[in-house]
């Protein structure tokens, strides 16, 4: 199905023309332009950048480009009362203080408005007490501490290393454990790759570097004061006490030099095993408190940040579709950064900019896509996906009726090893087919396809000769579109070698050292990986907007549904006695999956054979494809997470970044052996199985012949 069938355009106006127009040199130029000063959400600098992007998108040829503003809760350090952590002696004197800011990188010493490291939305407070080291502060780490080691964190300040899971989950876990404060730090074991120098001589984290980030547990709510509704002029706002997802204890991030000073004196219990030890020259004792001579010393936090309602700005560009203007394909990525945003987000924003320019060139030559393409530069992603969520809340009725697909465009790179894709199963075939047509940028794969290098470097664990595609989790702007609204979504970026590089994110993530030079010197000097990501993201948008039949394959959903049903059944079967006692059966779910598989197969045959020249029939089939993702939405949402409504996928309750399949059943089964009322717990498992069964069956029926 040629894309050129869509709007009777001349053959040169096809995907190839669009892809050929994308230039690495332009992406490089745009990245440089976007990274010279900080663009923190809610600041004048970020408003000015929004206006610049609006102006340039208009110049590129989009039909309209609008700024949409919202007044949302943001969080900033107090400029005159800095945040820090002290070691205090028995007299209350501060004998060591953590740093007040990161040593600025060369060439940026005189840049103003670099926000010092802080944990966004931390409450104010000055807790004082003994320290407990809690490893990564994951659910399993607290289980180990509390259940196995009998260490009580109540009234203690906990120190946790960054990595493995979203920082908001760490804080939530610490709160539930009774901690009075949380210190987050970057251990070299997670953020310093062996054999690589620290920035500015390499891409590793220096000891004074610190990861900023929000510590919310929003569960998809958007602005904490206006859950479910846009934060506009007439919005009703909750009081701070009722705000969604705010932490209740002070939290502050530090680098590994400061962590060294806090951890080197730790006493109490030894670490349980090597998985709790990082690579600082400290014992990694768990505590509580300091050892021997230092046992009278305590740790004190001084947190003075404030949360305030602040105006944010999205940029929304429209390229109207020629045939189906009421069908929207969205390409969106955020613009706000913690500091310079060399990778996050501007490596993504620069790619979006070049994609818009290329589409604009085609439009200037008389071409239009079949469907409408919306381009978005989101604000306040770093503060909880606020810009995208508020816009989607404001436009939810349109989006749920007209939204075909959402392609996310945050950081284009987190490494330079191979491609990484997370998407709905509906897009698997689109991604495979597209990457087979693109050239690999990888050394040693000259003249080979991207599909080939990707498959070689990141093979699928299930299917030989195919690359790995992961589940969508959260922690980025696709969340509201996929998890709340059920719009087919995907994301792609270049990544590291997960086999050899065990660090969590890239080492300089959310630090002052995430600069243009970091990218240009160490990650992608030729901007060839950026160009490849532009081709993947842009190519997906092109196909989704321009192919006559939507490039979705519902059979791939059938395959994963079977895999997920097997997985959750196997988890449940760890409790065979209880399943028998409480009559827990997955038969209905497997039956629904079987029905889905059969109906999807028949639908695919009809899709292959129907008369594509019949516009009514074409629209009907395309609508069935578009609405399939929507059919997995439960309007009631998941238990205690009303804005996570997708029954097949949700962000893990233990790690927002990770996707979990059949999350309702998974959460009902989690740690079920420790529940005080097993009968009620297994009753909830049965309820969740029935919801999943109904949803899969209902989704299958949307693919049946309509009459």
């Amino acid at each position: 199905k040629s894309s050129s069938e869509a709007t009777n355009i001349t053959p040169k106006h096809n995907m190839k023309a669009f892809l050929d127009e994308l230039k690495a040199e332009n992406i490089k130029k745009f990245l440089h332009n976007f990274t010279q000063i900080p663009h923190l959400a809610g600041t004048e600098q970020n408003f000015q950048l929004a206006k610049q992007i609006q102006s340039q998108w208009k110049e590129f040829g989009l039909d309209s480009v609008e700024l949409t503003h919202y007044d949302v809760l943001l969080s900033y350090p107090n400029k005159t009362h800095p945040n820090y952590i002290s070691i205090i002696n028995e007299d209350g004197n501060e004998i060591f203080n953590t740093s007040l800011f990161e040593p600025p990188p060369a060439g940026y010493e005189n840049v103003s408005d670099i926000v010092p490291p802080f944990s966004a939305f931390s409450p104010q407070g000055m807790p004082e007490g003994d320290l407990v080291y809690v490893n990564y502060a994951r659910t399993e780490d607290f289980f180990k501490l509390e259940r196995d080691m009998k260490i009580n964190c109540s009234g203690k300040i906990v120190i946790a290393r960054y990595g493995k899971v979203f920082r908001g989950n760490k804080v939530k876990n610490a709160q539930l454990a009774g901690a009075t404060g949380v210190i987050l730090y970057s251990d070299p074991d997670d953020y310093f790759a062996p054999g690589v120098k620290s920035y500015p001589d390499g891409w590793n984290l220096p000891g004074g570097g610190v990861q900023r980030g929000n510590i919310l547990n929003l569960n998809g709510a958007g602005d904490p004061l206006t859950p479910g509704y846009p934060a506009n002029e007439y919005a009703y706002r909750r009081g701070m006490a009722e705000a969604v997802g705010l932490p209740s204890i002070p939290v502050h991030p530090i680098g590994y030099y400061d962590a060294q000073k806090l951890l080197e004196k730790m006493g109490g219990s030894a670490s349980p095993d090597s998985s709790w030890r990082g690579s600082l020259k400290v014992p990694y004792n768990v505590g509580p408190g300091f050892t021997g001579n230092f046992s009278t010393q305590k740790v004190k936090m001084h947190i003075h940040s404030t949360s305030e309602v602040t105006r944010i700005y999205n940029v929304i560009g429209t390229l109207r579709g020629a045939v189906e203007p009421d069908r929207y394909v969205i390409l969106g990525g955020h613009r706000d950064s913690w500091v310079f945003g060399g990778i996050d987000p501007q490596s993504g924003a620069a790619v979006v900019h070049e994609i818009v320019r290329s589409f604009g060139m085609l439009k200037k030559e008389g071409w239009r896509p079949r469907r409408t393409i919306l381009f978005a530069s989101w604000d306040a992603e770093e503060f909880g996906l606020l810009g995208s969520t508020e816009w989607a809340e404001e436009n939810s009725r349109l989006l749920q009726e007209r939204g075909v697909a959402y392609i996310n465009a945050d950081s284009s790179i987190e490494g330079n090893y191979t491609l990484r894709v997370d998407c709905t199963p509906l897009m698997y075939s689109l991604v495979y087919n597209l990457t087979k047509e693109l050239e690999s940028p990888d050394e040693g794969f000259e003249g080979k396809s991207l599909y080939e290098s990707w498959t070689k470097k990141s093979p699928s664990p299930e299917f030989s000769g195919m690359p790995r595609i992961s589940k969508l989790g959260s922690g980025n702007d696709f969340e509201v579109f996929f998890q709340r609204l059920g719009i087919a979504s995907g994301r792609a970026r270049y990544t590291k070698n997960w086999e050899t590089n065990k660090f969590s994110s890239y080492p300089l993530y959310h630090s002052v050292y995430e600069t243009y030079e970091l990218v240009e010197k160490f990650y992608d000097p030729m901007f060839k990986y950026h160009l490849t990501v532009a081709q993947v993201r842009g190519g997906m948008v092109f196909e989704l907007a321009n192919s006559v039949v939507l490039p979705f394959d519902c059979r791939d959903y059938a395959v994963v549904l079977r895999k997920y049903a097997d997985k959750i059944y196997n988890i449940s079967m760890k409790h065979p006695q209880e399943m028998k006692t409480y009559s827990v059966s997955f038969d209905s779910l497997f039956s629904a999956v079987k029905n889905f598989t059969e109906i999807a197969s028949k639908f695919s045959e009809r899709l292959r054979d129907f008369d594509k020249s019949n516009p009514i029939l074409l629209r009907m089939m395309n609508d069935q494809l578009m609405f399939l993702e929507r059919a997995f939405i439960d309007p009631l949402g998941l238990p205690d997470r009303p804005f996570y409504r997708h029954v097949i996928y949700a962000p893990s309750s233990h790690n927002k970044y990770a996707g979990e399949s059949f999350p309702g059943i998974y959460d009902a089964l989690f740690d079920i052996e420790s529940k005080v009322d097993p009968s009620q717990a297994w009753g909830e498992v049965k309820r969740q199985i029935s919801i999943a069964t109904f949803t899969v069956q209902a989704a299958a029926e949307t693919l049946s012949e309509v009459a």
Epitope: Y84, S99, L100, G208, Q260
Partner: antibody, heavy 125, light 112 residues
Framework: EVQLVESGGGVVQPGRSLRLSCAAS????????MHWVRQAPGKGLEWVAV????????YYADSVKGRFTISRDNSKNTLYLQMNSLRAEDTAVYYC??????????????????WGQGTTVTVSS | QSVLTQPPSVSGAPGQRVTISCTGS?????????VHWYQHLPGTAPKLLIY???NRPSGVPDRFSGSKSGTSASLAITGLQAEDETDYYC???????????FGGGTKLTVLG
Amino acid sequence: EVQLVESGGGVVQPGRSLRLSCAASGFTFITYGMHWVRQAPGKGLEWVAVVSFDESNKYYADSVKGRFTISRDNSKNTLYLQMNSLRAEDTAVYYCARALRDGNNWDYFNGMDVWGQGTTVTVSS
Amino acid sequence: QSVLTQPPSVSGAPGQRVTISCTGSSSNIGADYDVHWYQHLPGTAPKLLIYGNSNRPSGVPDRFSGSKSGTSASLAITGLQAEDETDYYCQSYDSSLSGWVFGGGTKLTVLG
């Protein structure tokens, strides 16, 4: 060229004050911890004070605690030592020194890799 | 009385090897704090000779080497030369003083 130049020394009476300055050039001053070290006539080197790059930490030798204050102005690439209640035993050559970068810890917990030529302070009635 | 103890003087003939010891305690060298060595000609700026126990800054000849064991450290100079005749200081951090400590200094004389 990396350089440290001290100034402000002189002859002063006991009990009076003096302010020493150290102008840094040839390196990114704002990213380094800085020390003051002195050498009394006929004696060895004695560490006086240190300040972290961001002034979050300042430490002093017991002999000067409560009388001397170390500070810095990162916008002027200058280190200071404010010396109050001076005593005869404070007579010395005062050196400023840059803290040494060495991987495992804040530089100001390490040695000193670049030194100035020194400025002489004489406390005498 | 310095916290770190060095011999007041050592001497050696040109071409010979000499060592200068630096003895501390469990709150400084013995607490795994690094030892650094300086060369100081009075009236000039001290010069860093060895950092982090055994590392040489660029420009320092490999005739100079450092080592550390337990609560002591030492500086070795091989192939003594006339220009080596000056004062040498060891330095470390002391956790009980929360301060940086120097040895009393060692005067090296090159005989000849």
